[in-house]
């Protein structure tokens, strides 16, 4: 069993989606093993709970790793009230959490 720490990426909502009145921020964890990984969302440094959903892929047939996407969903109005969006990832292959973030309006 070879441990692989996740590569972590964060994606802001598209302009197209914002036009529809909602905002989905996505945190993507790629190619990790074992499957246990934790994602925490912070908005302007405040921990979010209850408004995110996770989806994990089955093990990759080539390298037996997993990928996971966590989606934080907000209304467009709530999204525009805040500036810094961050996802914090913990996994046994990481000695400390990995945080990826962006400032709304600067990406």
């Amino acid at each position: 069993r070879t441990v692989a720490a996740p590569s972590v990426f964060i994606f802001p909502p598209s302009d197209e989606q914002l036009k529809s009145g909602t905002a989905s921020v996505v945190c993507l964890l790629n190619n990790f093993y074992p499957r246990e990984a934790k994602v925490q969302w912070k908005v302007d440094n405040a921990l979010q709970s209850g408004n995110s959903q996770e989806s994990v892929t089955e093990q990759d047939s080539k390298d037996s790793t997993y990928s996971l996407s966590s989606t934080l969903t907000l209304s467009k109005a709530d999204y525009e009230k805040h500036k810094v969006y961050a996802c914090e990832v913990t996994h046994q292959g990481l000695s400390s959490p990995v945080t990826k973030s962006f400032n709304r309006g600067e990406c």
Epitope: R1, E36, A37, K38, T90, H91, Q92, L94, S95, P97
Partner: nanobody, 126 residues
């Protein structure tokens, strides 16, 4: 609280072996997983290996995991009666020179480390 103390580091010739120990004290019954990391100067701390101390819903006690750089040369083990974890390191190379740390977590789904030792220096000379 759990306290961890590493020992067994030192100076060794390339091709040699060392066995590191990590003695746990305090609330050792709460340890679910113990791991070894290392940190070379100017580099990030790197995962080497881990072992499940107490079985849970996902893994049996004694299940081991290895990082790429430890696979095949390093072996992790533990002795629950002595509350000690071990890292046997064989065929050491100069690039294995680093400070070696043990870490532990009480999480049944181990995704972060609650406890860290102070580290032990390993120097491999060519």
């Amino acid at each position: 609280q759990v306290q961890l103390q590493e020992s067994g580091g030192g100076l060794v010739q390339a091709g040699g072996s060392l066995r590191l120990s990590c003695a746990a004290s305090g609330r050792t019954s709460s340890i679910h997983l113990m791991a070894w990391f290392r940190q070379a100067p100017g580099k990030e701390r790197e995962f080497l290996a881990s072992i499940i101390w107490t079985g849970g819903t996902t893994y049996y006690a004694g299940t081991t995991f290895y990082g790429d750089s430890a696979e095949g040369r390093f072996t992790i083990s533990n002795d629950n009666a002595r509350n000690t974890g071990y890292l046997q390191m064989n065929s050491l190379k100069p690039e294995d020179t680093a400070v070696y740390y043990c870490a532990a977590t009480s999480l049944v789904n181990p995704t972060r480390y609650d406890y860290w030792g102070q580290g032990t220096q390993v120097t491999v000379s060519s």
